[in-house]
Amino acid sequence: SGVFQLQLQEFVNERGVLASGRPCEPGCRTFFRVCLKHFQAVVSPGPCTFGSVSTPVLGTNSFAVRDDSSGGGRNPLQLPFNFTWPGTFSLIIEAWHAPGDDLRPEALPPDALISKIAIQGSLAVGQNWLLDEQTSTLTRLRYSYRVICSDNYYGDNCSRLCKKRNDHFGHYVCQPDGNLSCLPGWTGEYCQQPICLSGCHEQNGYCSKPAECLCRPGWQGRLCNECIPHNGCRHGTCSTPWQCTCDEGWGGLFCDQDLNYCTHHSPCKNGATCSNSGQRSYTCTCRPGYTGVDCELELSECDSNPCRNGGSCKDQEDGYHCLCPPGYYGLHCEHSTLSCADSPCFNGGSCRERNQGASYACECPPNFTGSNCEKKVDRCTSNPCANGGQCLNRGPSRMCRCRPGFTGTYCERHVSDCARNPCAHGGTCHDLESGLMCTCPAGFSGRRCEVRTSIDACASSPCFNRATCYTDLSTDTFVCNCPYGFVGSRCEFPVGLPPS
């Protein structure tokens, strides 16, 4: 599709005569009829196969024709065609005299013709004008012409349709030959494919507009080259998506079991030494002068009950001082001025005289001690409970309250997490320091083998190009369901590109 353009420039008819030689009265009011047709070796009358056009009266006798001349006509004259330009043509230009205002052929006498020219030849599509001048005995016509393509048509013969666009269906302008020229950032046959951010990972990333890098599930970062750990992961990393590889000091499926409580929580106070003793378990060894599970309690000098015989202890900056009850003396009230007659034995203790009644000794009932049976026996002073167990006085005996994961009289034994058979569906239980681990039989998974699964042949993500992976339960192999445009057992080949 294109247009043949004819630009009339000058017509000369100095004598103001018709083709018959008869003069026009009062002068030759001149208009033109143009006929464009297929190439003929000898131009003959007949249909104007490529189109025809008439002008209004453009002047009298001799005149120059202005561009877009007034009077309603257009200059250059337009002869549109909607076919492939053949490259050859025939052109007939007739100059006519208009005695009145009606310019229709049937309204004019045949002898109103002033002149007629006919040319033929080759003409390539292009922007350049061809200038021509045709002279007869009485007239001269100067004109130029060319063929150009209509909007959105390109190529040597205006046969290539190309309409620039910048939308979902393409992002391009048109080259002179009709080929597409992609806008910056777009590629592909119809410039529909964005060019992603430079360095964007080919498999893990994609883009919907230029210079973008969007990550496929499981990947993150500017270039989609970092994996995302598993949703439930707490203190771990990954090298492939959804993994959970534990940081140092952490264990368990989701790296949520603390194997290094001492480092992570620093529970021991006042400069005590911390020892890890299993999952979330620790023991604090206190510095002198401190006590408590976390060595959080400061011991006073009096805490060791140094004063005997009911003496009361007073803390002092440089130590302690015993205030002795009547009948006793000495640094610790250890010396007595009493005898059995003074009933010095407390808590049901029985008195025995010594040294001919100059002194005495108390025999204490169970649970009491001290030279006067004044002290209740504390069977926990030796810290007999292991692994952070809490010692409790229970009358004549003591008892250890163990931390989770330990048992025995002194909390000396680690409880087997496997003892309660936690692994379902015949899973094998392994006792680890970090807790238990189940090794599941085929067809089961989960922390306790509680999830019934088939062997997941898709776990290694064998399918490419966003294909859907299915496990064939009969063979435990994978089957890739390819998206449109891809083929191959793994959907690895674009359609039309066979394996090399």
């Epitope: 919907s208 969007l214 990550c215 599930p217 499981g218 993150q220 970092e226 439930g232 859907t468």
Partner: antibody
Amino acid sequence: EVQLVESGGGLVQPGGSLRLSCAASGFTFRHFPMAWVRQAPGKGLEWVATISSSDAWPSYRDSVKGRFTISRDNAKNSLYLQMNSLRAEDTAVYYCSRGYYNSPFAYWGQGTLVTVSS
Amino acid sequence: DIQMTQSPSSLSASVGDRVTITCRASEDIYSNLAWYQQKPGKAPKLLIYDTNNLADGVPSRFSGSGSGTDFTLTISSLQPEDFATYYCQQYNNYPPTFGQGTKLEIK
């Protein structure tokens, strides 16, 4: 136990600014991508922004691009959302969440209310 | 953006009932779908990810199924604590999008 605690919400006039913070604990913060998700009163959930773990690469929903900035401080286990040029339609409870635009949002904070009104 | 449409938008059920909520995506999202539970005044909680994987600590009465564009959340036997609003979310295409929610009420 994973904990995400948001702060910084409040009443602000249209065109104003607000900075939300999220303190994370119970997981190794630097290993995980983080996100902000919001919920307008009586409405559904709407993803706002995400940030990757190590290179802190941000992504935003179109309606907040150029106005909101997501950032993180791995040393402080903290996530931030700087909100400028606030509009009435930004009124919502803003949740801090662990996740990315292409993964589930596994853990959520309790939310902080942002009200944009004159 | 991918549109996620949940149905029904609300439903009433009794303790012990089996309940199904559906979620439809406007285009293929493979199995990249999650379900969340939200109670009034509380944050959402992840229930299910990758269509059918139970999040840590979620009771086994919750299950998910589907692929492509049609997905289902099933609660096999409703418990009193299950009355809440449920949201589906796709994370296959950027940006991530949520369904409008399904409010599960006591009959």
